[in-house]
């Protein structure tokens, strides 16, 4: 038995920040779980982890180079990524594991979310603005 994960197909980070919501076919309330976000087609780089435990506060871990926070819903975990760089544009996959209560469960691999990080391009003000309208 596998947990199903739904993610937006694509998100654009205009201000170098993005909210990626991972929606699960499973209620995480009163469960011990580990939700993680993986970068790349092969999911090689784990960039953020949210650990939840019925008896303690949610714990969030960010890999160096990623500024991450996490928020828990009943059937979702939202990863808030900030200070993203253009070269961090990639596909990101949500993963979930539930350890307690038994049985251990994890997810079917999702389709992932392409996060497109747009660089900040400041437009210079024109040297000769046109005549102002009355």
């Amino acid at each position: 038995n596998k947990i199903l994960v739904k993610q937006s197909p694509m998100l654009v980070a205009y201000d170098n920040a993005v909210n990626l919501s991972c929606k699960y076919s499973y209620n995480l309330f009163s469960r011990e779980f580990r939700a993680s976000l993986h970068k790349g087609l092969d999911s090689a780089v784990e960039v953020c982890v949210v650990y939840g435990n019925y008896s303690q506060q949610l714990q969030v871990y960010s890999k160096t180079g990623f500024n991450c926070d996490g928020k828990l819903g009943n059937e979702s975990v939202t990863f808030y990524l900030q200070n993203l760089y253009v070269n961090q544009t990639d596909i990101y996959f949500c993963k979930i594991e539930v350890m307690y209560p038994p049985p251990y469960l994890d997810n079917e691999k999702s389709n992932g979310t392409i996060i497109h990080v747009k660089g900040k391009h400041l437009c210079p003000s024109p040297l000769f603005p046109g005549p102002s309208k009355p």
Partner: nanobody
Framework: EVQLVESGGGEVQPGGSLRLSCAAS????????MGWFRQAPGKEREFVAA????????DYAESVKGRFTISRDNAKNTVYLQMSSLRAEDTAVYYC?????????????????WGQGTLVTVKP
């Protein structure tokens, strides 16, 4: 809840070697990391080395690179720290830590559980 038990500390002469072990028990996920930190008398606990479960990520403090090697036996849920070319400044209590992060974190705050520590003394 994760329990950590360290062993292998002791007294050794400068230039000598020691191998520390840290056995973890409790509920484990598919990826996590374990690391070694040390604390000398009157000093802060400092990062030494760390390795993740998948063994595809390891990190070392600059002061131990080339002298210490971290490894792990996943079947035994045990992490090892092979220490060679030991110096007087390596004298400290060595602590094993566990984090749910899946990378070899050098950040002390990332570690959720700690062992009781094992003393390493390097003196002539």
């Amino acid at each position: 809840e994760v329990q950590l038990v360290e062993s292998g500390g002791g007294e050794v002469q400068p230039g000598g070697s020691l191998r520390l072990s840290c056995a973890a028990s409790g509920r484990m996920f598919s990826n996590y990391a374990m690391g070694w930190f040390r604390q000398a008398p009157g000093k802060e606990r400092e990062f030494v080395a760390a390795i993740n479960y998948r063994r595809d990520d390891a990190d070392y403090a600059e002061s131990v690179k080339g002298r210490f090697t971290i490894s792990r036996d996943n079947a035994k849920n045990t992490v090892y720290l092979q220490m060679s070319s030991l110096r007087a400044e390596d004298t400290a209590v060595y602590y094993c830590g566990f984090t749910y992060a899946g990378w070899a974190s050098s950040r002390r705050d990332d570690y959720d559980y700690w062992g009781q520590g094992t003393l390493v003394t390097v003196k002539p």
